[in-house]
């Protein structure tokens, strides 16, 4: 019995087609992805093949103005239109709190939303009961398939799930649910979830009875053969894991941002054993036309976005200096504003011993592309922020050793004076450079704000200590020559859309007046 699994993950509100790098579409003839194009391909496969499931492995939320404005209603609407069969909860589904998940998505979705390792307690338990499920048995042709969901247990550090949701260990939580499916005579089981490729592989290895793993969170690109675009495969598609009980379990993921549609064909025998598995992600490029009815619907929803981008978010009473003459040479107040917003967006009081789980921010000065003049009645709009942060990136959470941070700050000024983008703006860090010294030895003082303290204060950086840092995804991926970050990071979780982080902060503060205050000397 052959099953076709179509899958997406980490779409991050790319409802419209995007350019090849998943930023805003500029030249339509070269654009990719988007729900209208996705629908065309899904329908084509549904017509051609008998047993098809369309699955999403989480993080539909967060990433463009679509989410900022529609807050998840757009996800429910368009996923319903595409007739998704199931979705797993990702960490970003909690970005607007539990209410921001329940009202727009859980109550509106016409497909099951899954996670076996999230347990509700207290008053939330009855409110959320039945709105998401640990598993769902889906009829597919003459057969039935069990789908079990899972979500990163790091979600409380990455998003805002509140205090009434407990995130359990994925493997511990999944096993009893899979066992339950087996007792219901369901012998074809897909684990669909959002914990990253390493955990996907562990689930394939450790959870008895799971036949296929469809994952997300780590934006992993897998491909067999010559890849069709710029993404470099982390392995073959599907990636085969040998389980502890001796079965070959295919593990798949489909990069991110709706650029690809994962396409996996599985042949099962009567016992539910995977006899064969093969496929590849399908690049959703312009050779696939956008479905006209979905496209028309997108255009209708688009109108509200255009109105939103010119509305006032808040005010500044000072000039926000985002000029390259400042931000690539010295501390600039636009850099301070953005870093403060980045830390504020990551406030998570999850442990009494810590005032927060992260206190540090670094930001490449070259990523700040425009100032904002306060003399326009102080008004700040989304449009203004899009000029400052035009690349559509995210502000991510990483874990780095102190020694890696020291290398990063040395790199920040290794060719100082040439107006290059690697000069770092900071938050929660005091750095002193001596530019008379030779490159690689210019950082003379590096103090960082404590987290395990009730009164935050600055302490010298310890080389062997592991620190959490918020930074742009561009830096996490080694951009601007920060190869040491990419090579040495111990953990990387993608965060919220850069503009959204700053806009939320400005809206919260109402009036801002960031200063140059001696963070960089």
């Amino acid at each position: 019995w052959e099953l076709t699994i179509l899958h997406t993950n980490d779409v991050h509100s790319r409802l419209e087609q995007t350019s090849e790098d998943s930023s805003k579409c500029v030249n339509a003839s070269r654009c990719m992805g988007g729900v209208a194009r996705l629908f065309t391909k899904v329908q084509q496969i549904r017509r051609a093949e008998p047993n098809v499931l369309l699955l999403d492995a989480g993080d539909q939320y967060q990433g463009t103005i679509w989410f900022t404005v529609y807050k998840g209603a757009e996800v429910a609407h368009f996923m319903n239109a595409l007739r998704y069969d199931a979705m797993a909860l990702g960490n970003h589904e909690f970005d607007n709190g539990v209410e921001g998940l329940i009202e727009p998505l859980l109550k509106e979705a016409k497909f099951p939303i899954l996670s076996a390792n999230i347990k509700a307690k207290g008053p939330l338990a009855s409110q959320i009961s039945g709105l998401y499920l640990p598993y769902k048995v889906l009829p597919v042709g003459d057969e039935v398939v069990g789908i079990v969901g899972y979500t990163s247990k790091e979600t409380p550090f990455l998003s805002n799930p509140g205090t009434n949701l407990v995130f359990e260990d994925e493997i511990t939580a999944l096993q009893p649910e899979v066992d339950k499916l087996k007792t219901l005579n369901v012998n074809k089981i897909i684990a669909l979830g959002h914990s990253g490729f390493e955990m996907d592989k562990l689930i394939a290895q450790k959870v008895r009875g799971v036949d296929v793993v469809v994952g997300g969170h780590s934006n992993t690109f897998l491909y067999t053969g010559n890849p069709p675009s710029k993404e470099v495969p982390a392995g073959k598609y599907p990636f085969i894991v040998t389980s502890d009980d001796g079965r070959k379990v295919p593990v798949v993921q489909a990069y991110a941002f709706g650029k690809y549609l994962g396409y996996l064909k599985i042949e099962f025998d009567e016992r539910g054993n995977v006899i064969s598995s093969h496929g590849n992600p399908i690049l959703l490029n312009s050779s696939i036309p956008e479905d006209p009815s979905i496209k028309a619907d997108i255009n209708k929803w688009r109108i509200k976005l255009d109105n939103y981008s010119t509305q006032e978010l808040g005010k500044t009473i000072v000039y926000l200096d985002g000029s390259s003459q400042s931000c690539r040479f010295r501390e600039c107040n636009m850099g301070n504003l953005i870093c403060d917003a980045m830390i504020n967006n990551n406030l998570r009081h999850t442990d009494e011993m810590f005032w927060n789980h992260v206190s540090m921010c670094i930001l490449n000065g070259g990523g700040i592309r425009s100032p904002i003049d306060e003399r326009n009645n102080g008004t700040i709009t989304w449009e203004n922020l899009a000029a400052v942060l035009p690349f559509g990136g995210t502000f991510d959470l990483v874990q780095l050793k102190g020694s890696t941070l020291k290398k990063a700050f040395e790199h920040s000024v290794h060719r100082y004076g040439q107006s290059t983008g690697e000069f770092l703006q900071v938050g929660g860090i005091h750095v002193v450079y001596d530019l008379s010294r030779k490159p690689g030895d210019r950082v003379v003082k590096l103090d960082v704000l404590c987290t395990k303290c009730r009164v935050p204060s600055y302490d010298p950086l310890k080389m062997d200590e592991v620190y959490k840092v918020i930074l742009p995804n561009f830096l996490a991926n080694g951009g601007d020559g920060f190869q040491m970050i990419k090579d040495e990071l111990l953990r990387h979780d993608s965060g919220d859309q850069d503009i959204n982080v700053v806009s939320t902060y400005i809206s919260k503060m109402k009036v801002i007046y960031p200063a140059v205050e001696g963070r960089i000397k």
């Epitope: 019995w1 042709g141 003459d142 057969e143 040998t242 001796g246 070959k248 025998d269 009567e270 016992r271 054993n273 995977v274 006899i275 064969s276």
Partner: antibody, heavy 114, light 107 residues
């Protein structure tokens, strides 16, 4: 649990036909196919062909083409294998086996003798 | 048709021995290979499917490996109940074909 139960032993004369049945249970019958395998006395296994339960599509091994007919009765989840123009070298045990031979019938002994 | 050459055709071994049986296909069969066990009474049982996946209930002393046209069944420590005849089966293309069998006997 998958179970395949075959019909009983048969003794046939050369030139006659034999029809062996295989009744399946414990799985969604229409979603799969059935193989038939022959084993002559003291010999190895030989694949004869297979039938798709849902629509009766068949694929026969060239060696048996023209003499073998596989049919299906979806209402009783039973598959049949008929072998015609029997000769002495058709004396063997005939097995039905699920799609990828994960489960086997107990075998049906067919003796061709004058 | 794809020919499956299985070797050895028979072997004598003692309890606790490591036993290896090989199957060579006349062309690439890309993982589409099963290993079957037939006890003297005639009952057939699949041990390994898709080259290396172990059927449920089959002891972990049985393992399968290989790719392309060369495949191996290994019994890491032979037990009394393992004395039987073993067959490989390719299902990469029609007609499916079996190896000639390997009879594992007590030394």
């Amino acid at each position: 649990e998958v179970q395949l139960v075959q019909s009983g032993a048969e003794v046939k004369k050369p030139g006659a036909s034999v029809k062996v049945s295989c009744k399946a249970s414990g799985y969604t019958f229409t979603a799969y196919f059935m193989n038939w395998v022959m084993q002559a006395p003291g010999q190895g296994l030989e694949w004869m062909g297979r039938i798709y339960h849902n629509n009766g599509d068949t694929f026969y091994s060239q060696k048996f083409k023209g003499r073998v007919t596989m049919t299906v009765d979806k209402s009783t989840s039973t598959v049949y294998m008929e072998l015609s123009s029997l000769r002495s070298e058709d004396t063997a045990v005939y097995y039905c086996a699920t799609s990828y031979v994960g489960d086997w019938g107990q075998g049906t002994t067919v003796t061709v003798s004058s | 048709d794809i020919q499956m050459t299985q070797s050895p055709s028979s072997l004598s071994a003692s309890v606790g021995d490591r036993v290896t049986i090989t199957c060579r296909a006349s062309q690439d069969i890309g993982d589409s290979l099963n290993w079957l066990q037939q006890k003297p009474g005639g009952a057939l049982k699949r041990l390994i499917y898709a080259t290396s996946s172990l059927d449920s209930g089959v002891p972990s002393r049985f393992s399968g490996s290989g790719s392309g046209s060369d495949y191996t069944l290994t019994i890491s420590s032979l037990q009394p109940e393992d004395f039987a005849t073993y067959y490989c089966l390719q299902y990469a293309s029609f007609p499916w074909t079996f190896g000639g069998g390997t009879k594992v006997e007590i030394k």
